[in-house]
């Protein structure tokens, strides 16, 4: 339904508080380097303008699209050329090209300082002095560092952030109350950002059809009692929501997400028995709860899939008449029966089924041709099962840190051209699959592990896309969304790689390592490990383990020494020499 003024429509639907928050997120995700104060000023100007449109929808410029209004506002930033370079050229374009241009310049790895957490008392004072500014600053800092963060979900995080400070700044032990909550929000936020980044990559790089297929599989697992038509409706609506958010249309996205939550709760009887608690919550919590809701129980006595998808004489007729609908039904039926499969596995099975029908429905004997299609699924199912089994055994044997190190070595050997910080970040995240998923029973391991790995490998893909250095990474990232993980798994040592020149500076450490947190110290050691492998890609596990053990002992020894800096200098030289000898550098 058309509105005279889109901006007035969204302001009224969302309310002033959410409107302002979403506009701030949108602006911070586009202009990631702009100071906080500049964004607040722009947001206030947009908000005042929106209020004039609410008062009179026929007022000047109120009929303009949100992209036009927001783009015009962003293009008033005086330092656009100096700060953003060629991004300023976007302002010479007309909509919709201008917005597309802004989207293309979103930076997944912006050159921004690490967020350092102030002392608890300092934070509590800031919170009490100006709660509104404090919370806006949170939105701004997260949004600019995570330009694809799911905006309505960020509102939910901000609400929890506020609740944490409200509660803990009154507590007897503020730090004990607040710090675990902030750690949890940070970790959940990173995970949420990465999950959304995959959704946006899916839409932007592989198209709406790919996203819809993912959504059919996931929603069918989650709502196995819902009819196909119901799942299809939810998929269509969910696709619209994520298309909008990934496209920077955050007001529309948040509004449509609220509508979708409302629809789901009004129709929960025909969707899932698990929604009751979610639907009693306020809007932001409700939407989050629905997105995370556990899978409903599978209906009893579901018939064999073979009847409709292999044995029926109408398979090719049904496929030819409406290919995507028929494949959607196949995916729905398979997924609702298999909560124990990863979504990407289900999509591989659907792709195999589609390829088989494309071939066999043009064959002289179609039924004979596709009769054994389900047999082709067996190796596809067994491959991730075996991989997860092997890696969970390795994780249980090594523990998280050493499991991460094993993956660091594995991935550095596969794609040694990738930057060391990226290899460390990605391998550390890959390694977290162990503690995240291996504790689950068999029936939950694969969906946990492989779908998590898809999220992490997408981080590698988006970081690599910014500065491509490896054809192998590009190939695995672009050829097939659902085969990314098998593609990376199949990579062997890159025999074409010319080892990096040895640089002693890379392996020089100082006393500051002693004051780092355990996590930061691990990252330092893992950075050294990657560099070692880049220097000596043919080094054996045993050689690398020996060097890393010596390195750990060296750090421990020097951190206990009275004159730490002298210890690091003298013992460090010895360690480098010994390591070179051990590795034959």
């Amino acid at each position: 339904d058309a509105h005279k003024s889109e901006v007035a429509h969204r302001f009224k639907d969302l309310g002033e508080e959410n409107f302002k928050a979403l506009v701030l997120i949108a602006f911070a995700q586009y202009l990631q380097q702009c100071p906080f104060e500049d964004h607040v000023k722009l947001v206030n100007e947009v908000t005042e303008f929106a209020k004039t449109c609410v008062a009179d929808e026929s007022a000047e410029n109120c009929d303009k699209s949100l992209h036009t209004l927001f783009g015009d506002k962003l293009c008033t930033v005086a330092t656009l050329r100096e700060t953003y370079g060629e991004m300023a050229d976007c302002c010479a374009k007309q909509e919709p090209e201008r917005n597309e241009c802004f989207l293309q310049h979103k930076d997944d790895n912006p050159n921004l300082p690490r967020l350092v957490r102030p002392e608890v008392d300092v934070m509590c004072t800031a919170f009490h002095d100006n709660e509104e500014t404090f919370l806006k600053k949170y939105l701004y800092e997260i949004a600019r560092r995570h330009p694809y963060f799911y905006a309505p979900e960020l509102l939910f995080f901000a609400k929890r952030y506020k609740a944490a400070f409200t509660e803990c700044c009154q507590a007897a032990d503020k730090a004990a109350c607040l710090l675990p909550k902030l750690d949890e929000l940070r970790d959940e936020g990173k995970a949420s950002s990465a999950k959304q980044r995959l959704k946006c990559a899916s839409l932007q790089k592989f198209g709406e059809r790919a996203f819809k297929a993912w959504a059919v599989a996931r929603l069918s697992q989650r709502f196995p009692k819902a009819e196909f038509a119901e799942v299809s409706k939810l998929v269509t609506d969910l696709t619209k929501v994520h298309t909008e958010c990934c496209h920077g249309d955050l007001l529309e996205c948040a509004d449509d997400r609220a509508d979708l939550a409302k629809y789901i709760c009004e129709n929960q009887d025909s969707i899932s028995s698990k929604l009751k608690e979610c639907c009693e919550k306020p809007l932001l919590e409700k939407s989050h709860c629905i997105a995370e809701v556990e899978n409903d129980e599978m209906p009893a006595d579901l018939p064999s899939l073979a009847a409709d998808f292999v044995e029926s004489k109408d398979v090719c007729k049904n496929y030819a008449e409406a290919k995507d609908v028929f494949l959607g039904m196949f995916l729905y039926e398979y997924a609702r029966r298999h909560p124990d499969y990863s979504v990407v596995l289900l999509l591989r099975l659907a792709k195999t089924y589609e390829t088989t029908l494309e071939k066999c429905c043009a064959a002289a004997d179609p039924h004979e041709c596709y009769a054994k299609v389900f047999d082709e699924f067996k190796p596809l199912v067994e491959e991730p099962q075996n991989l997860i089994k092997q890696n969970c055994e390795l994780f249980e044997q090594l523990g998280e840190y050493k499991f991460q190190n094993a993956l660091l070595v594995r991935y550095t050997k596969k794609v040694p051209q990738v930057s060391t910080p990226t290899l460390v970040e990605v391998s550390r995240n890959l390694g977290k699959v162990g503690s995240k998923c291996c504790k689950h029973p068999e029936a939950k391991r694969m969906p946990c592990a492989e779908d998590y790995l898809s999220v992490v490998l997408n981080q590698l893909c988006v970081l690599h896309e910014k500065t491509p250095v490896s054809d192998r990474v590009t190939k695995c990232c672009t050829e097939s969304l659902v085969n990314r993980r098998p593609c990376f798994s199949a990579l062997e040592v890159d025999e074409t790689y010319v080892p990096k020149e040895f640089n002693a500076e890379t392996f020089t450490f100082h006393a500051d390592i002693c004051t780092l947190s355990e996590k930061e110290r691990q990252i330092k050691k893992q950075t050294a490990l990657v560099e070692l492998v880049k220097h000596k890609p043919k080094a054996t596990k045993e050689q690398l383990k020996a060097v890393m053990d010596d390195f750990a002992a060296f750090v421990e020894k020097c951190c206990k020494a009275d004159d730490k800096e002298t210890c690091f200098a003298e013992e460090g030289k010895k360690l480098v020499a010994a390591s070179q000898a051990a590795l034959g550098l």
Epitope: C316, A320, C361, A362, A363, A364
Partner: antibody, heavy 118, light 106 residues
Framework: QVQLQQSGAELVRPGSSVKISCKAS????????MNWVKQRPGQGLEWIGQ????????YYNGRFKGKATLTADKSPTTAYMQLSSLTSEDSAVYVC???????????WGQGTTLTVSS | QIVLTQSPAIMSASPGEKVTMTCSAS?????MHWYQQKSGTSPKRWIY???KLASGVPVRFSGSGSGTSYSLTIRSMEAEDAATYYC?????????FGAGTKLEIK
Amino acid sequence: QVQLQQSGAELVRPGSSVKISCKASGYAFSNYWMNWVKQRPGQGLEWIGQIYPGDGDTYYNGRFKGKATLTADKSPTTAYMQLSSLTSEDSAVYVCARGVILGSFDYWGQGTTLTVSS
Amino acid sequence: QIVLTQSPAIMSASPGEKVTMTCSASSSVSYMHWYQQKSGTSPKRWIYDTSKLASGVPVRFSGSGSGTSYSLTIRSMEAEDAATYYCQQWGSNPLTFGAGTKLEIK
């Protein structure tokens, strides 16, 4: 655009063999069945068989088993039909045709005339 | 194998006249396709999946049928329609063609 270019006319002795080619261009050769059809002068069309270049799968009309052998090569995107133990009955125009979903033939080659004569 | 019988074998029609030719199958088939062939050239797909017109085929042509009985109709005959028309079944191996209906212009 899709094109199927067949090899030239052949004049061969009875008892010998011949290999006819069909060079495909303008589409994903591996993903479509290539069919072969026989047409004798003044006669109707007779389906010989088909090959799927993606994996080499074949279907034959029982009447041509042992007579025709279908092969395909993905790198020059070419399908071949070898006819063996030739007799005058094999004199005909042979046409390759691309098969699509639900079994129709949407593109046809120009035909190769085979004459078997002593 | 399924035998397709086309009738009539030969027919002629005046310009503007409605033309109907049939293809009868010895047992039920899933889909029927029709091809047009003019002398000295390869056949061209004309009607496929029983009733769909191939690219470039004039809308005066139509196809219909199910089971064992299929037909091709020309609403209003034109000189360029003079050719031999073959039906072909899909759904049973081997694929088979009818013997053809030769359509001439009066």
